[in-house]
Structure formats: C-alpha cells, structure tokens
C-alpha cells in the first residue's frame, strides 16, 4: 500500500547540549512495525538511526551518532515514531531526513533542526 | 492509551483568573503538540493556543494574545492554560488536545473543564 | 488569519442517506484539513486527517476528499449513531474550525 512521509513543516529547535525530538508520521497511519524506518543527512545520506527487522541497527550509524540517539516507538503501530537525539551539538544544525521503507515502497520527508547557543547573550547597552 | 485527564469545574468572578491542567499519560509527552480550545455555550470550537512542551515556547491565537498563558511541566507531563481578567464571554468549556507535532491533527482530547464567569 | 466555511449549518437527514458536508478555505491549505465529530456533552473525536485519512476506529462509512480550497466529508450511509455535530479545522497555519453543521433526523 501507498503511504505519504510528514514531518514538521517549521524547523525544530534545539539548545547544544540539550535533547531534541524529531517527529515523522505516514499518512494514511498504519502500523509501521514490520517497516524500514530510519533517518538520514543530506546531502551524503549519513545515517542517523536505522530501525529494521523490527529492531535498532546500531552498526548503520554515522560514528558521531552511535550512542545520543533513541527512536521512540510507543507509537509505531499507527506510524508515528519520533527520534531522540541527547547531547546535541552544533554540527547537528541543519536538515534531517526521515524514511519509512514498505517492501520496495519508500517515502520520506525533510526536517530541519537550529541549533542555538544556551548561553548566547546580548550585553544590555 | 494516550489520556489527557483535565483538572474539575470552575466558578469565577469577573476580572479574575482561572488556570486548567491538562495531564497526559501513555505516550510521548515532551514532543507533542498540546493545543487549548474552548467552546462556548451552544457555540462552536476556537482554538486559544499551544506548547510543545520539549520547546517550551507556546503560540497563541491573536484575540487572546496578552490575556492567555499556556506552559507546560515536562517531569509531571502536565499542561496548564492560565486565563486572566476573564469576563462573562469566557464561560465556555475547556478543552486540551494532543497534535502529534505542531499544526497536526488533534487525535486525543481531555474530557473538557467547564469555567463559569459570574458576579 | 485562514477562515474556514462550512455548509450547510444543519442538514435534515434520515437513517440510510447518504450525507455531504462542505468546508472551503479562504486560502489554499494543501490537505491539511481534519473532521471531528461532537456529541452533546463531549469532546469532539477526530475522525479524518488529512483531507482524506480514515483515523483509526473509525467507521469506514466516513470518507474525506479534496485539497486546495474545497474538502468534502460523507458519511455513505448514515447510521443511528452519526446524528452529531461535524467540524473541519485546518492546521496549515495554527489551527481555525469551521462553524460546524449539526446532522439532525428527519
């Protein structure tokens, strides 16, 4: 069956340090269990997260995302997952892509994420 | 099961404040969207505002800019709509509602809080 | 601000009808357009998302078409149960509903 990738349509933002949540859904929802769920950086398709055969592939991952990322699942059955990215850097900043994989069907949608400086400030004056 | 269990009925004079909860259980709290809507005596839905409470920063509809603060509690996934200097129009019912993101569909609803605005 | 316009306000309908309620945008929305349904005393329930997306649950007697300015939600043949009041609501810019229609028996 055919399906749309949605994901945030304003960019998501995000302190360093801090954790950030990447929202992405099919439409129409159906359980995405049994998919290919995964999320990449253009333009060299980095791989941030990789879930497939129904379990995290970790040993897909770029190196400077092994251990800062989760993918959230509770979820997964009506096609909804989020990715938890902990510790965020600055070199996160700028666009991520999710993809959900059905057999040889696969869509995917663009996200972006700012990242901001917690202690950036401006002297009064 | 996602819920969202909002806090009892209120009675308010005019002039005042009322603050409602809006506790979630069952799912991600921190990165969906909680959106507020009210809905007057025989009238139909206005949504007031919302947070997604993993950002912190709420947005709200012009005509209740100034007058309506929507924050969120991440370590009690509670969120609360504080309306102030409340007149007889803001009788209404009370409604929270959960978007999967910003500007989604609203799949769960609380069970809505009735504010009565009386001298 | 994007005005959501629902027509008609309330439909005479009897069990077995097929019914059609419209909503128009001021703007286009792409399809970002959702249908609730409210009962008296309760909250609304989501019941299309996405112009034409079934939420899960949901009867398949409800469908929803269009995009743009112009969305449609039928209900093929109306059951006991679909006398309520209907709302569209887009979400392409914040949130607006439509005024509702209220699907009354005949």
């Known amino acids: 069956g055919q399906f749309r990738v949605i994901g945030p349509r304003h960019p998501i933002r995000a302190l360093v340090g801090d954790e950030v949540e990447l929202p992405c859904r099919i439409s129409p929802g159906k359980n995405a269990t049994g998919m290919e769920v995964g999320w990449y950086r253009p333009p060299f398709s980095r791989v941030v997260h990789l879930y497939r055969n129904g379990k995290d592939q970790d040993g897909d991952q770029a190196p400077e995302y092994r251990g800062r990322t989760e993918l959230l699942k509770d979820a997964i059955g009506e096609g909804k997952v989020t990715l938890r990215i902990r510790n965020v850097r600055f070199s996160d900043e700028g666009g991520f892509t999710c993809f959900f994989r059905d057999h040889s069907y696969q869509e995917e949608a663009a996200m972006e994420l700012k990242v901001e400086d917690p202690f950036y400030w401006v002297s009064p004056g | 099961q996602v819920q969202l269990v909002q806090s009892g009925a209120e009675v308010k004079k005019p002039g005042s404040s009322v603050k409602v909860s809006c506790k979630a259980s069952g799912g991600t709290f921190s990165s969906y969207a909680i959106s507020w809507v009210r809905q007057a005596p025989g009238q139909g839905l206005e949504w007031m505002g919302g947070i997604i409470p993993i950002f912190g920063t709420a947005n709200y509809a012009q005509k209740f800019q100034g007058r309506v603060t929507i924050t969120a509690d991440k370590s009690t996934s509670t969120a609360y709509m504080e309306l102030s200097s409340l007149r007889s129009e803001d009788t209404a019912v009370y409604y929270c509602a959960r978007g999967y993101f910003s500007e989604e569909a609203m799949d769960y609803w609380g069970q809505g809080t009735t504010v009565t605005v009386s001298s | 601000d994007i005005q959501m316009t629902q027509s008609p306000s309330t439909l005479s309908a009897s069990v077995g009808d097929r019914v059609t309620i419209t909503c128009r945008a001021s703007q286009s929305i792409s399809s970002w357009l959702a249908w609730y349904q409210q009962k008296p005393g309760k909250a609304p329930k989501l019941l299309i998302y996405d112009a034409s997306s079934l939420e899960s649950g949901v009867p398949s007697r409800f469908s929803g078409s269009g995009s743009g300015t112009e969305f449609t939600l039928t209900i093929s043949s109306l059951q006991p149960d679909d006398f309520a009041t209907y709302y569209c609501?887009?979400?392409?810019?914040?949130?607006?509903f439509g005024q509702g229609t209220k699907v009354e028996i005949k």
């Open positions: 609501q887009q979400y392409d810019s914040y949130y607006t």
